[in-house]
Amino acid sequence: EINGSANYEMFIFHNGGVQILCKYPDIVQQFKMQLLKGGQILCDLTKTKGSGNKVSIKSLKFCHSQLSNNSVSFFLYNLDRSHANYYFCNLSIFDPPPFKVTLTGGYLHIYESQLCCQLK
Amino acid sequence: EINGSANYEMFIFHNGGVQILCKYPDIVQQFKMQLLKGGQILCDLTKTKGSGNKVSIKSLKFCHSQLSNNSVSFFLYNLDRSHANYYFCNLSIFDPPPFKVTLTGGYLHIYESQLCCQLK
């Protein structure tokens, strides 16, 4: 299933960097979230659970990330114009069943004011 | 697994239209192929098999398409400059397991010579 464009603010700019917000439903217990730039995997985070609700986080492609009960935020730093592209949050839901894949995304526009090191 | 940029000629122009080629490995028996323009779904085709290897094709978002044993071609007609964008082939593999999603894509450049109705 593809949701298409994110229906929330996916890009949050601060200090020459960007926080890319990848949301998931809060009933989801075990999942994989990948951040794609165009068709390339930038970041890959998997959350699994065991008995006693012990959580395990696996990052195949590590990015600075932040996990909440309904979102994963990935942080990109030192923005320059080459960061402008389509970014997709690729969510694979394992638990609860059935298995499901959703892809949401948007275009990251880079404006002069958001660059990390503007020429004065 | 995400392949990123297509390592084959994804766009084939003819008669003011374009054929967008979405390849998949020929061992894949059951799959969903979606054509995305940016983050939007343009086309959606699912191939499943039943008993006696009976094939079923389902299109949630219908486009003129052509299926072979290792590719799906989607056809866009009456090209104009608004068609210029990133296009992605989003392949979900159901069989053989495990579940797998690949996203390949590229930028469709529209040049004067490819437009369907050039002003003379």
Epitope: T46, T48, F94, D95, P96 | -
Partner: antibody, heavy 124, light 107 residues
């Protein structure tokens, strides 16, 4: 092609020990949670133990808790079951099985690929 | 722990007939964490259905699963010769637990 091959079964006296192994090939082993399931010949299936992708989450059936230990070596694509203080009721065919999704979890997931099993007989 | 009961114990049918197998849980199985497996003599179990109603990859569409809460059903629309086997239901919403099985044999 995915293959799971169990080994290490055999005949052992009550109170004895055995170590079962499951060698995996044709898959990215650390993408998968793994479980051991046993079956008394001619009877039903019983889940024994599960382990997540890196071994930091494990769980056991009440009938084997404190006696069996599950572990894995991802570098060797191998899953293990150390069985101590064996009892006659542990006699069974032991299968290893992987999680269906490639989620890395053994928890709340069904099992797709199974090995052919290794027979453990506990008898005096 | 959740106990699963399967009925009937044995189902005698002919090829081409419809098979309906039942699995009842002693308490509600959360979010349909229920699977069905097929096992033939001398072989390992094979996953057919997960999440109560989703067919696993490569499983023919004559197999279907339904139900929720405590009552679940596996239906084989038209029995093929290769479908005669033992069928187990399994709940996997907590420590996994299997039912005792239903044997489908040729009448």
């Amino acid at each position: 092609e995915v293959q799971l091959v169990e080994s290490g079964g055999g005949v052992v006296r009550p109170g004895g020990s055995l170590r079962l192994s499951c060698a995996a090939s044709g898959l990215t082993f650390d993408d998968y949670g793994m479980s051991w399931v046993r079956q008394v010949p001619g009877k039903g299936l019983e889940w024994v133990s599960g382990i997540n992708w890196n071994g930091d989450n494990t769980d056991y059936a009440d009938s084997v808790k404190g006696r069996f230990t599950i572990s894995r070596d991802n570098a060797k694509n191998s899953l293990y079951l150390q069985m101590n203080s064996l009892r006659a009721e542990d006699t069974a065919l032991y299968y290893c099985a992987r999680d269906y999704y490639g989620s890395g979890s053994y928890y709340n997931v069904p099992f797709d690929y199974w090995g052919q099993g290794t027979l453990v007989t506990v008898s005096s | 722990e959740i106990v699963l009961t399967q009925s009937p114990g044995t189902l005698s049918l002919s090829p081409g007939e419809r098979a309906t197998l039942s699995c009842r849980a002693s308490q509600s199985v959360s979010s349909s964490y229920l699977a069905w497996y097929q096992q033939k003599p001398g072989q390992a179990p094979r996953l057919l259905i997960y999440g109560a109603s989703s067919r696993a990859t490569g499983i023919p569409d004559r197999f279907s699963g339904s139900g929720s809460g405590t009552d679940f059903t596996l239906t084989i629309r038209r029995l093929e010769p290769e479908d005669f086997a033992v069928y187990y239901c399994q709940q996997y919403g907590s420590s996994p637990f299997f039912g005792p099985g239903t044997k489908v044999d040729i009448k």
